[in-house]
């Protein structure tokens, strides 16, 4: 007996698609061996049509694929645009076609349903609207108009022109009699249910001279579109339900046990906790279509998703719906990176963001997820030299280390920086990742003075004290600007006296600005790194003023202004820019959204997504090599 299992019979109609799942014991050998789908010939033999090693027969070109799910012990063969020629006996199997590790599948493709005599066939999707047209002759113009549904042997009245409506159709049916010029009445049924399917008879008049017309209503449950995405990647569900529901609440739900479809997100403000920080529902278009983006895909996100429209914001019978079956591939091309990064108030974090290494020239972005309403993600910084105004001097996006990873450094952390951030590019939309920043108690490791004032034409020396734990790290000073942080020469002044219980390995490294000019004003960072991987940073603002007294200035820690955690940028005096991430390709419909709200105002609560990949110690963020 073969251990392979699958459907013995598959019946479909021309033009349809099939999705055939074959099950195998998920041993390590089976998981990685060749998977195939072949057609059995009359004289034995089995001709391969598609295999997991990339082969696709010319018969299947452009209309079939085979996807292996090693973690489930299944592979799926999708075949589209079926024709009757596809009918036959097939095998799905592992290894070599002739080896016997296979399962026999009979595929039968029949002709689509033909028209019955004098019967108009209406094929409509579940939840949508159908208009059944019923012609009549002049002699029946003033007579009763009615629509019956054939239930078994008996016609049951559905609606008539005297005002009767069958209780099963209350609130979703109407009978329209056209103007006198047209000998036609119409019955419009909204929010179609599967139970509405069947044979209908419309009639004008009740005697032997009545006009009758047969109608066959077929209500289609939407076939789920199969979506395959990588673990840790991103998926976008595009939901187009039609203009008739443009003003009705929209939802995306995930089918769980039973008939339940648990709301993932809806336009009434509901969002499932498991998707906090990693979901956006874009504003809907006038035609009622909308998109939902989910990032940071997890194994447990796999399943059947429905989007729909209903005033309750959740699935009800008669909701127009679209369906997807999401598979999450655990053999992901997207590297592991921490889903939670912790930083000490007053200190910094360095976040590593993966991107598709084939798209090294793409523009990189970092945005802050906001849960209000349907979720949005205003941009904070990009790789083209744009930084949101209130992040000047404390946020930088670096192309390093490159080759599939970029780095975002955020310093001068306060509790308001806690939240979810997205890494993305204007290239491959599947490579959107989410990281949660948590602010923890503790002291910054690097010690620098507070804001410093330099005098024009004089020399300024700014100290940065590095504890001994950073003895093996490269220490640097740099001047921040919108495009990054340009390295500056610095001097090692020997061991620092700023740390208790710290041996000779602590270091005081100074930045010296000779003959200060106005151009020297701005933000300076001192920090540590190992190669291209960045660690903790500390920021100092240097102001430049006219000469008051001669001599150079040497700034000590004692002259520091406010503690870093108390320092809040006053953004009230300048216009606040806001690029909102409605693209790059996040929502292609709206490239940028102007928003004059100050994102620095109002605290953001941190939401713990229960990540098992937390990363502790703000000084260790650069250790995660890919």
């Amino acid at each position: 007996k073969s251990p392979i299992f699958g459907p013995e019979e598959v019946n479909s109609v021309e033009g349809n698609s099939v999705s055939i799942t074959c099950y195998y014991p998920p041993t390590s050998v089976n998981r990685h061996t060749r998977k195939y789908w072949c057609r059995q010939g009359a004289r034995g033999g089995c001709i391969t049509l598609i295999s997991s090693e990339g082969y696709v027969s010319s018969k299947y070109a452009g209309r079939a694929n085979l996807t292996n799910f090693p973690e489930n012990g299944t592979f799926v063969v999708n075949i589209a645009q079926l024709s009757q020629d596809d009918s036959g006996r097939y095998k799905c199997g592992l290894g070599i076609n002739s080896r016997g590790l296979s399962f026999d599948v009979s595929l039968e493709v029949s002709q689509g349903p033909g028209l019955l005599n004098d019967t108009k066939v209406y094929t409509v999707d579940l939840g949508r609207t159908v208009t059944i047209n019923c012609p009549f002759k002049t002699e029946n113009a003033q007579k009763r108009k009615s629509l019956y549904k054939q239930i078994g042997l008996y016609p049951v009245l559905v609606i008539d022109s005297s005002g009767y409506v069958n209780p099963n159709y209350t609130g979703r049916i109407r009978l329209d009699i056209q103007g006198t010029g047209q000998l036609l009445f119409s019955v419009v049924i909204n929010q179609l249910r599967l139970s509405d399917a069947g044979q209908y008879l419309c009639q004008a008049g009740d005697d032997s001279n009545s006009n009758k017309k047969n109608a066959d209503l077929q209500v289609l449950k939407p076939e789920p579109e199969l979506v395959y995405e990588d673990l840790r990647g991103s998926v976008t569900f595009h939901c187009a339900l039609g203009p008739e529901v443009a003003n009705v609440a929209k939802f995306l739900c995930r089918q769980s046990s039973g008939e339940n479809c648990d709301v993932v997100v809806n336009t009434l403000g509901k969002r499932a906790p498991a998707f906090e920080g990693r979901i956006l529902l874009n504003p809907q278009d006038k035609d009622g279509s909308f998109s939902v983006v989910i990032t940071g895909l997890r194994k447990e996100d796999a399943g059947r998703y429905l989007c729909g429209a209903h005033s309750d914001g959740q699935l009800q019978e008669g909701s127009p719906i679209q369906a997807w079956q999401l598979f999450v591939n655990e053999e992901s091309t997207i590297p592991r990176s921490p889903t939670v990064v912790k930083g000490v108030a007053g200190s910094s974090v360095a976040v590593l963001c993966p991107y598709n290494r084939k798209e090294s020239k793409s523009i990189k972005y970092w945005c802050l997820w906001e849960g209000a309403q349907n979720g949005r993600c205003p941009l904070l910084v990009d790789s083209e030299g744009w930084v949101k105004a209130q992040y000047e001097g404390r946020l930088s996006l670096l192309e390093e280390p490159g080759n599939g990873t970029f780095t975002v450094i955020l310093n001068q952390l306060t509790s308001r920086d806690a939240g979810f951030y997205w890494c993305l590019t204007n290239g491959d939309t599947l490579w959107r990742t989410t990281v949660e920043i948590k602010i923890i108690e503790g002291e910054p490791n690097l010690k620098v003075p507070g804001n410093v004032t330099a005098v024009l034409g004089e020399t300024l020396k700014v100290p940065c004290h590095f504890p001994c734990k950073f003895s093996s790290y490269e220490k640097y000073w740099c001047k921040w600007n919108n495009t990054g942080c340009q390295a500056l020469p610095s001097q090692d002044e020997g061991p620092s006296k700023a740390f208790v219980n710290c041996d000779e390995n602590s270091r005081l490294v100074s930045l010296t600005l000779n003959l200060v000019t106005r151009a020297d004003e701005g933000w300076y960072w001192c920090g540590v790194k190992q190669g291209h991987f960045y660690g903790e940073t500390a920021a100092v603002y240097v102001a430049v003023e006219e000469r008051k007294a001669a001599g150079s200035r040497d700034v000590s820690l004692a002259k520091a202004d406010a503690a870093p955690d108390e320092k809040v940028l006053d953004s009230g005096f300048r216009e606040i820019e806001n690029k909102a991430i409605q693209d790059p390709r996040l929502f292609a419909e709206e490239k940028a959204v102007a928003d004059t709200r100050d994102q620095a105002d109002g605290s953001r609560a941190s939401v713990d997504s229960g990540s098992s990949e937390e990363q502790g110690g703000s000084s260790r963020h650069h250790h995660h090599h890919h």
């Epitope: 449950k221 089918q255 769980s256 059947r304």
Partner: nanobody, 126 residues
Framework: QVQLVESGGGLVQAGDSLRLSCAAS????????MGWFRQAPGKEREFVTT??????????YYADSVKGRFTISRDNAKNTVYLQMNSLKPDDTAVYYC?????????????????WGQGTQVTVSS
Amino acid sequence: QVQLVESGGGLVQAGDSLRLSCAASGRTFTTYGMGWFRQAPGKEREFVTTITWSGSTNYKYYADSVKGRFTISRDNAKNTVYLQMNSLKPDDTAVYYCAASTVLRDPRVPTEYDYWGQGTQVTVSS
């Protein structure tokens, strides 16, 4: 909720045929697959056959022990699934349960099914 009601069980001779029906009612618009399991006294519940559907495509799965003898079918309009059992054997004696699922990852696994009927007894005498 979805309610399932089985009928058609009974006592037959070996070699005879029997047709079981399973009528579904309630919120059947969310169901995706329906099937039959059976349980003989003192034994585990075992998979017999399942039919799943997507639009106008049907997929039929059978256990090795019933292949070629049992046939599953459905009547969409009546929300009913049928199990035609031919060439019955004494080994087929069991309580036959109808089951329905909204999301079916592996049709052979009972825990994948969300709704169950009360069962109908099939006895095959030699």
